[in-house]
Amino acid sequence: YDFTNCDFEKIKAAYLSTISKDLITYMSGTKSTEFNNTVSCSNRPHCLTEIQSLTFNPTAGCASLAKEMFAMKTKAALAIWCPGYSETQINATQAMKKRRKRKVTTNKCLEQVSQLQGLWRRFNRPLLKQQ
């Protein structure tokens, strides 16, 4: 999916009002400096691409993020504010339902959510010095 035509300001508002708090709740008890940055993004569409990948694609050691509160709110925000996003996700959602797993918070998941927090921060960053 190409995130170029999303309403970035509306997505930013959704992040600031709820998604950010859910991410913090998930990470509670973890030091903010515990994980180094291992993924980045270079503009808002790119950030959303990486956020979607880390939130909804199962990875080795962390297969369960898609059912977390922050993930469901992320999905809702993208569905509302990114034209045509919902249609592209129907097949992916059906496949996900088939392989639903027991909810376990592993260290790998904590690291992944830490990277998500970094990507969301970049998505919401103020303009850098423009020189």
């Epitope: 980045s40 993004c41 270079s42 790119h46 010095k129 020189q131």
Partner: antibody
Framework: QMQLVESGGGVVQPGRSLRLSCAAS????????MHWVRQAPGKGLEWVAV????????HYADSVKGRFTITRDNSKNTLNLQMNSLRAEDTAVYYC???????????????WGQGTMVTVSS | SYVLTQPPSVSVAPGQTARITCGGN??????VHWYQQKPGQAPVLVVY???DRPSWIPERFSGSNSGNTATLTISRGEAGDEADYYC???????????FGGGTKLTVL
């Protein structure tokens, strides 16, 4: 852990070519801008080239423009520097480094390799 | 192209504060990054975006940037701080990375 490892350095005659490689591990390579920076013996750091995270755009220092080519293979997590028409003044340790970018601004180089020595001598 | 100017050397007594400057035209409008390099080693980022510090760098390292001068401040200097320090910016107008000439810090 996050790592950059350079290879391909050595002794080469003036006018000849050399290809340096940088293997990245421990981070999502395709999301970072990548640089080559060099350091002549006893001298300061000199930036050589940068390639965008996607490979779409490339920028070179004037001193290497037209002679050096930076490329990346995001599927293999590798960065390359093809150096042609080498000169004695290209003698240096060559480092690869990563930097996040925002739009067309490259941010700080937060991870560096250990460097590979290139000596251009007849 | 853009030029960054650093003093070749700075000395500090153990426990005292060292200040390393980096000068450039209208430098305050650029994001300045600082690197530490010890002999035979690769550079290490110590301050980025003028004043931010990576999580692995001690709080003794800090930075500021305004007008035509950026400053790296190292408080309570230690023998282990002896190194070369480089400032760096991304010059958007020419799409080039620019490094300062480097400053050798000596802890007396």
């Amino acid at each position: 852990q996050m790592q950059l490892v350079e290879s391909g350095g050595g002794v080469v005659q003036p006018g000849r070519s050399l290809r340096l490689s940088c293997a990245a591990s421990g981070f999502t390579f395709r999301t970072y801008g990548m640089h080559w920076v060099r350091q002549a013996p006893g001298k300061g750091l000199e930036w050589v080239a940068v390639i965008w995270y996607s490979g779409a755009y490339i920028h070179y220092a004037d001193s290497v423009k037209g002679r050096f080519t930076i490329t990346r293979d995001n599927s293999k997590n590798t960065l390359n520097l093809q150096m042609n028409s080498l000169r004695a003044e290209d003698t240096a340790v060559y480092y690869c480094s990563r930097s996040p970018q925002w739009e067309d601004i490259f941010e700080a180089m937060d991870i560096w390799g250990q460097g590979t020595m290139v000596t251009v001598s007849s | 192209s853009y030029v960054l100017t650093q003093p070749p050397s700075v000395s500090v007594a153990p426990g005292q504060t060292a200040r390393i400057t980096c000068g450039g035209n209208n430098l305050g409008s650029y994001s300045v990054h600082w690197y530490q390099q010890k002999p035979g080693q690769a550079p290490v980022l110590v301050v980025y975006d003028d004043s931010d510090r990576p999580s692995w760098i001690p709080e003794r390292f800090s930075g500021s940037n305004s007008g035509n001068t950026a400053t790296l401040t190292i408080s309570r200097g230690e023998a282990g701080d002896e190194a070369d320090y480089y400032c760096q910016v991304w010059d958007m107008s020419s799409s080039l990375v620019v490094f300062g000439g480097g400053t050798k810090l000596t802890v007396l």
